[in-house]
Interface confidence: medium
Amino acid sequence: SAPGEDEECGRVRDFVAKLANNTHQHVFDDLRGSVSLSWVGDSTGVILVLTTFHVPLVIMTFGQSKLYRSEDYGKNFKDITDLINNTFIRTEFGMAIGPENSGKVVLTAEVSGGSRGGRIFRSSDFAKNFVQTDLPFHPLTQMMYSPQNSDYLLALSTENGLWVSKNFGGKWEEIHKAVCLAKWGSDNTIFFTTYANGSCKADLGALELWRTSDLGKSFKTIGVKIYSFGLGGRFLFASVMADKDTTRRIHVSTDQGDTWSMAQLPSVGQEQFYSILAANDDMVFMHVDEPGDTGFGTIFTSDDRGIVYSKSLDRHLYTTTGGETDFTNVTSLRGVYITSVLSEDNSIQTMITFDQGGRWTHLRKPENSECDATAKNKNECSLHIHASYSISQKLNVPMAPLSEPNAVGIVIAHGSVGDAISVMVPDVYISDDGGYSWTKMLEGPHYYTILDSGGIIVAIEHSSRPINVIKFSTDEGQCWQTYTFTRDPIYFTGLASEPGARSMNISIWGFTESFATSQWVSYTIDFKDILERNCEEKDYTIWLAHSTDPEDYEDGCILGYKEQFLRLRKSSVCQNGRDYVVTKQPSICLCSLEDFLCDFGYYRPENDSKCVEQPELKGHDLEFCLYGREEHLTTNGYRKIPGDKCQGGVNPVREVKDLKKKCTSNFLSPEKQNSKSN
């Protein structure tokens, strides 16, 4: 039988009546064009919906926008288009929502051709009121908020000017011309690349990287010969052209660009790219593209300085020019990442790591599934996950994998069971232990979302026909109930729930089509009466994360510590609630060699946990360039894995001595660095 439809499933009592009383329909009386939806703030219940109807004319685009606001999680909407003077809003800029709970919103308007600048509408009270502001420039990008101060905005103009506002878009100042890329760093710092002669494209590889820490009063050139730059965690990366040829290398800084070190990564040529796949304050996952149009590259993981890298995964799928990769951080369990590799026969296979890239393995075959036609051996195969690449290839995959930090251990994804990803119609699979084991959850493709920190999972079948049924589960996808939310089926376009998976409301978006017109419609369902009571202590059970063999004393030790979580029992039908906080108890483990990566000049042979000296460096003094100084490294080959908390046990010795000699890569010597003031 299909998952969740056998006799064992406990039914939720009287759910139809309870849900019917909590289903709210809203019909939007405007033409069906495009719709975009944004949540304003956290736990505020405020949603903004922008509907846009385009009429492409020969000379310009004529359009009409409508703006709606809800303050009850989408149950009711009010048309507030008059607050933006019925102006046509440019959908490509979306709605720029301020960080945290600032309540700030910026909408960018379309203005007629001859105007000297663009126009924005600003709100700082969760979209209750808007102020119209005419800009002294035409924006090229969406307004970017400083993460530290939501009053500080930056934007690039169509003429490559870098514009900054210090009063939430009221007044703007051009702080620099000829700017290609700009990003906020920490402490209201702005990093940007600038060209000297031609243009961003023409000067690629000859750009300069600049920094301002005072919103444009003064500047410091922190890099030259720049191709591109990126920020990840506490790391600033720059790809820099080599002196003699067209190759480029990654340089890294952990002090906002004051000092740089060359990353121990392969250089790349003109047609290749680097990509920061994931970064935190401990380390970074870096993809380095292979030469040629291969569609794959290598994942490297860094040390705590972003300088020494270990090869993590070969043949990592990442389409040329940095198009699509399936790399996914499983946020419901630390250390877990999923991605795809392109095997020698050009088939695509899914790999998973549970230890932050230390080891990668195939996903275990779900127990309730058969191997498909891609499997050579019908008894031995793996689960393969559909992610961004499958979606880009227009396979029947409506959603990428889903996990939430507060729904511990839960991962939901489309997949197929075989030797590789299949082009056949996928099913939906769930893991409740962070990816170690999987179960088929739903037959065929579905949209899905997590509510109440995992207490409820909601799904809607992906179909070309109109739909009127929603499915929900209160036991992490084992058993499913179906609810008909409307008599008149709608063409479904999307599920919307508040980010963070704490809400108990879900909005189903779609449109109705009659002979003459089509209209947007939303149905918001509140599940609060399904989970009638608040969860108590007895509803939770202790779960040891990363546990695969309770008999093994290392069981659960990942990155040097174990974590026990209090998790909701599958059989408990109760509310975690909006204030639910994940309860976890960490315990440190003794160190083993598994807790160390190989140091500069060392590598791990296949299937060995000992680090051995690279043959070409045997007998040589290990000297390398760090922060512009020549360093001498005394090591027995190991360096603690970033974020590893083990104590006791193995403790390989390492010592770095400053040789008091200056060294630079071709990138930037201190004398090339200069400061300027406006």
Epitope: C591, G649, V653
Partner: antibody
Framework: QVQLVQSGAEVKKPGASVKVSCKAS????????MSWVRQAPGQGLEWMGI????????SYAQKFQGRVTMTRDTSTSTVYMELSSLRSEDTAVYYC??????????????????????WGQGTTVTVSS | EIVMTQSPATLSVSPGERATLSCRAS??????LAWYQQKPGQAPRLLIY???TRATGIPARFSGSGSGTEFTLTISSLQSEDFAVYYC?????????FGGGTKVEIK
């Protein structure tokens, strides 16, 4: 020979802080972890926490979290244990003890424990008003 | 945290006799267990680590055995200098924890 020499006895008032030092000699200071263990009068041994002299990373027992700080000074091969908000129950002998870790003898990947092979002479801390 | 329970609390043995001390863990600690001896006014002294390996300079009359949750320290023939308090300690998971101790006294 390998030695751990601790600072002298201390008498403190409730609410005050105490900082005990432990100077290591006779081995490479950064190659071994250091634990702190205390023993109240007539009671058993109680592990307080551990410090890795290489990077200074620490792990404390839950009971002392927020009150204890372990630090090290590699230039003098000394580790320190500071305990704040002292109460009468903190009256005890405080020991530093070396963890004789190394590349694991029991196979490279296993987590192997070597015990605490060298102990300081102990520092008596009396908390009294 | 892992709770270590030692028994008996006191063991009365005559010199030359065999002494068997027991230590039980509330969950498996594999072989990550050490035994210490402490005499009045002195710091503890490591006897056994890894559940069964004698530390440097420890006489052969001391032996350790066990794995998982049950451990034993055996002193084959008690000498006068062996009368002391003995502690077991686990280091499988932080926080490291000690047993309450077994006092070996002269009968």
């Amino acid at each position: 020979q390998v030695q751990l020499v601790q600072s002298g006895a201390e008498v403190k008032k409730p609410g005050a802080s105490v900082k005990v030092s432990c100077k290591a000699s006779g081995y490479t200071f950064t190659s071994r972890y250091m634990s702190w263990v205390r023993q109240a009068p007539g009671q058993g041994l109680e592990w307080m926490g551990i410090i890795n002299p290489v990077g200074g990373s620490t792990s404390y027992a839950q009971k002392f979290q927020g009150r204890v700080t372990m630090t090290r000074d590699t230039s003098t091969s000394t580790v320190y244990m500071e305990l704040s908000s002292l109460r009468s129950e903190d009256t005890a002998v405080y020991y530093c003890a070396r963890d004789p870790s190394g590349i694991a003898a029991a196979g490279p990947a296993s987590r192997y424990y070597y015990g605490m092979d060298v102990w300081g002479q102990g520092t008596t801390v009396t908390v009294s008003s | 945290e892992i709770v270590m329970t030692q028994s008996p609390a006191t063991l009365s043995v005559s010199p030359g006799e065999r002494a068997t001390l027991s230590c039980r863990a509330s969950q498996s600690v594999s072989s990550n267990l050490a035994w210490y001896q402490q005499k009045p006014g002195q710091a503890p002294r490591l006897l056994i680590y890894g559940a069964s390996t004698r530390a440097t300079g420890i006489p052969a009359r001391f032996s350790g055995s066990g794995s998982g949750t049950e451990f034993t320290l055996t002193i084959s023939s008690l000498q006068s200098e062996d009368f002391a308090v003995y502690y077991c300690q686990q280091a499988r998971l932080g926080p490291w924890t000690f047993g309450g101790g077994t006092k070996v006294e002269i009968k």
